[in-house]
């Protein structure tokens, strides 16, 4: 699977994670920071 | 499967206001952005701008800056695009558009006539 | 605002030429690119994303290539169910349409 950064209007789409952009899916994908879950890493889990 | 589904078309007067509706289903619109485009009769294509659903951020086109109101109800899955002080030049087919899950996913389109 | 500089805004041509539709960002738009075909009464169709890559279903007579600012369409051999209205959108920084170019058959 070919990937990249995530372009400069996807900054703040993951709220705490890295934006990977999945090219040939055609979509953005957060990578979460530990402790956090969801599509853009927005919910906060213990 | 994953759908956009638009207001239907509207008929306004110059100087009035018209607000467009786009209710997803299928996918939560908080997990995307929803952008808004524009087309005039036989014109190009016009990127009017997006919000985050999540967050509620927007970002408007110069052009349209003042004019434009793009929000989100995220308890019904739907975005509005309000555009304002309307002229014969905002005769267009509006559509929204999702991104970030996937690329650039359109909605019907929606046929604003502005005539007096 | 990035601008972009879609040319030509129209073009005829011969059943299996090739035709070759050019963009010109204003800046560097790190290859995040896409080109739309629009056929009238409908709305736009997606055929090609991140400059290059060809979506779902797309014949592979279409192709993009490019980088920095410049960037180019092209179709290989063109068919008669290719005539449509094609743009260029960049979308690194917000969103920019290019003017579109008018394919036609000569």
């Known amino acids: 699977v070919s990937i990249t950064k995530c372009n400069s209007d996807m900054n703040g789409y993951c709220l705490h994670g890295q934006c990977i952009y999945l090219v040939d899916m055609s979509q953005n994908y957060c990578r979460c920071e530990v402790g956090y879950t969801g599509v853009r890493c927005e919910h906060f889990y213990l | 499967q994953d759908q956009l589904v638009q207001s239907g078309a509207e008929v306004k007067k110059p100087g009035a206001s018209v607000k467009v509706s786009c209710k997803a289903s299928g996918f939560n619109i908080k997990d995307t952005y929803i952008q808004w485009v524009r087309q005039a009769p036989g014109q190009g294509l016009e990127w009017m701008g997006r919000?985050?659903?999540?967050?509620?951020?927007?970002k408007y086109q110069e052009k349209f800056e003042g004019r434009v109101t793009i929000t989100a109800d995220t308890s019904t899955n739907t975005a509005y695009m309000e555009l304002s002080s309307l002229r014969s030049e905002d005769t267009a087919v509006y559509y929204c558009v999702r991104s970030g899950t996937s690329f650039d996913f359109w909605g019907q389109g929606t046929l604003v006539t502005v005539s007096s | 605002d990035i601008q972009m500089t879609q040319s030509p805004s129209s073009l005829s041509a011969s059943v299996g030429d090739r035709v070759t539709i050019t963009c010109k960002a204003s800046q560097d738009i790190h290859k995040y690119i896409a080109w739309y075909q629009q056929k009238p009464g409908q709305a736009p169709r997606l055929l090609i994303q991140?400059?290059?890559t060809l979506q779902p279903g797309v014949p592979s007579r279409f192709s993009g290539s490019g980088s920095g600012t410049d960037y180019t369409f092209t179709i290989s051999s063109l068919q008669p169910e290719d005539i449509a209205t094609y743009y260029c959108l960049q979308y690194d920084n917000l969103r920019t349409f290019g003017g579109g170019t008018k394919v036609e058959i000569k």
């Open positions: 991140y400059t290059s």
């Open positions: 919000i985050d659903p999540l967050t509620g951020q927007t």
